[in-house]
Amino acid sequence: HTAAQDNCTCPTNKMTVCSPDGPGGRCQCRALGSGMAVDCSTLTSKCLLLKARMSAPKNARTLVRPSEHALVDNDGLYDPDCDPEGRFKARQCNQTSVCWCVNSVGVRRTDKGDLSLRCDELVRTHHILIDLRHRPTAGAFNHSDLDAELRRLFRERYRLHPKFVAAVHYEQPTIQIELRQNTSQKAAGDVDIGDAAYYFERDIKGESLFQGRGGLDLRVRGEPLQVERTLIYYLDEIPPKFSMKRLTA
C-alpha cells in the first residue's frame, strides 16, 4: 500500500498507525479500530473511518427539494461492522442484539429489529445532496465561481471524478451540492461519493481526516466561505423500508 516512505505516514487518513511491516518491509498503514490495511493513495472508506473514530481515545427555485425517500443520518455515531473490502455490512447490530439494515454510506434504512432481521444486500446510495448554509457575507457569491471552486475541491482534495458532481445550486445563503454515482458508473479505483461526502463533512466541521494538512480553507475569489450549518440527504437505489409509524411521526 502506498504511504510516505520516508516517515511512514498515511497522507489521506490520520486515523491510522503506520509501520514498515508491509511486503518487503514497505510502509503499511492500518486503520485504528479494525486493523485493516488501507490504501493511502486514496480516501479510506467511511466504514473504516467510523470504526476508527469509535475506537479513538467525535421565485425560480433552484434549490433541490429532497425526495420523500431521502434519508438523513439521525442515528449518529455507532461502531460499524465492515466487510473485508472496508464497506459497510448490510446488517448492523449493537451490543444488545438490536439490528438494522444500512445503505452503502452506513445510514439506517429500516426499522430496528432483532438478530432475526435479514438484510439481503447492501443497497447503494446513488444520490447525495449536501445542503450548506454559509455565514453572512458582504454580498452573494458569484454562482459560477462558487460552482467552479466546489468542483475543484471535490476533484483535487477528495479525488472524486468530476462527472460525479452532478450540480451545484446556490440561493444565498444556501448552497447545495449534488453527487450522483450509480453502481454501473463506478469503475474500479473511483472514489465513492459516500466517502467523498464524509471527508467533506468532517472538513466542514473542522475535523479534517487528512494527515498533516491544514484544515479546509474554502475561498471563492479570495472571499472565505464559512459554513454554519450542514445537512446531508442520502438517496438509495432502492427506497428505504420504514414502518408507517415512523413516517407519520
Epitope: 511491516d21 479494525s34 473485508p84
Partner: antibody, heavy 117, light 107 residues
Framework: EVQLVQSGAEVKKPGASVKVSCKAS????????INWVRQAPGQGLEWMGN????????NYNQKFKDRVTMTRDTSTSTVYMELSSLRSEDTAVYYC??????????WGQGTLVTVSS | EIVLTQSPATLSLSPGERATLSCRAS??????ISWYQQKPGQAPRLLIE???ESISGIPARFSGSGSGTDFTLTISSLEPEDFAVYYC?????????FGGGTKVEIK
C-alpha cells in the same frame, strides 16, 4: 541479531495481577508492533493484543480488553503486559513477538504464569 | 473476528512423504496469512508469510499457497525434524487470530 528477552516464571493467586516484561534488542524498537500471544497447557495459540512502541497505540483482543494493559518504556526498549483479576484458566505460557513484514518473525522465550490457590 | 479452521487436526505420515495442511478463513483475507511451526517447549517459528513468501533460513521444502479464504502449507518431503504442530495466523485485521493447529506425527 534481533532478540526478545522475557521476564521469568510467575506463580500467582486467583484475583491477583501479573506483569510480564519483554526487552527488545537488535532492531529499531519504536518501528515495529509488539504482540502478546498466550498458550495454555496443551492448547493452541491465542492473540491477546499488541502495542506500537512509537506512540504507545494499543489494541486488545475483546476477550481480554477489561483485564489487560500493555505499556512500553522506550528508554529501555521494553514492553510490558499486565493481566489482572487472574483466574486458573489464565495459567499459560505468555509470549511477546515482534510483528515484522507479515508474520510474527521474532519471539521471546516465553514466560510461564501459573495461577493457583 | 476472522475464524481460521485448520484441517486435518492430525496428519500421520512417514519421513519422505508429502504433507498438505489446509487453513480456511471465515472471510476473504487476501494473502494476509502466515504459517508457524511449533515443537514442544519451544516458541513458534515463522515459516511462511503473505500466504506464499518464504522466510530466510527456512528450508525450501516448506511452501505456501492460496488467497482469499483457502490456504495450504506444503512440506514436499518430510524430514524427521518436521514432525511438530503447525499453525496458520491471519494479519488482515484485528483481532489477529490463529487456527487451531495441525499436528504432523510420525506414522
Amino acid at each position: 541479531e534481533v532478540q526478545l528477552v522475557q521476564s521469568g516464571a510467575e506463580v500467582k493467586k486467583p484475583g491477583a495481577s501479573v506483569k510480564v516484561s519483554c526487552k527488545a534488542s537488535g532492531y529499531t524498537f519504536t518501528s515495529y508492533w509488539i504482540n502478546w500471544v498466550r498458550q495454555a497447557p496443551g492448547q493452541g495459540l491465542e492473540w491477546m493484543g499488541n502495542i506500537y512502541p512509537s506512540n504507545s497505540y494499543t489494541n486488545y483482543n475483546q476477550k481480554f480488553k477489561d483485564r489487560v494493559t500493555m505499556t512500553r518504556d522506550t528508554s529501555t526498549s521494553t514492553v510490558y503486559m499486565e493481566l489482572s483479576s487472574l483466574r486458573s484458566e489464565d495459567t499459560a505460557v505468555y509470549y511477546c513477538s515482534s510483528y515484522r513484514s507479515g508474520g510474527f518473525a521474532y519471539w521471546g522465550q516465553g514466560t510461564l504464569v501459573t495461577v493457583s490457590s | 473476528e476472522i475464524v481460521l479452521t485448520q484441517s486435518p487436526a492430525t496428519l500421520s505420515l512417514s519421513p519422505g512423504e508429502r504433507a498438505t495442511l489446509s487453513c480456511r478463513a471465515s472471510q476473504n483475507i487476501g494473502t494476509s496469512i502466515s504459517w508457524y511451526q511449533q515443537k514442544p517447549g519451544q516458541a513458534p517459528r515463522l515459516l511462511i508469510e503473505f500466504a506464499s513468501e518464504s522466510i530466510s533460513g527456512i528450508p525450501a521444502r516448506f511452501s505456501g499457497s492460496g488467497s482469499g479464504t483457502d490456504f495450504t502449507l506444503t512440506i514436499s518431503s518430510l524430514e524427521p525434524e518436521d514432525f511438530a504442530v503447525y499453525y496458520c495466523q491471519q494479519s488482515n485485521s484485528w483481532p489477529f487470530t490463529f487456527g487451531g493447529g495441525t499436528k504432523v506425527e510420525i506414522k
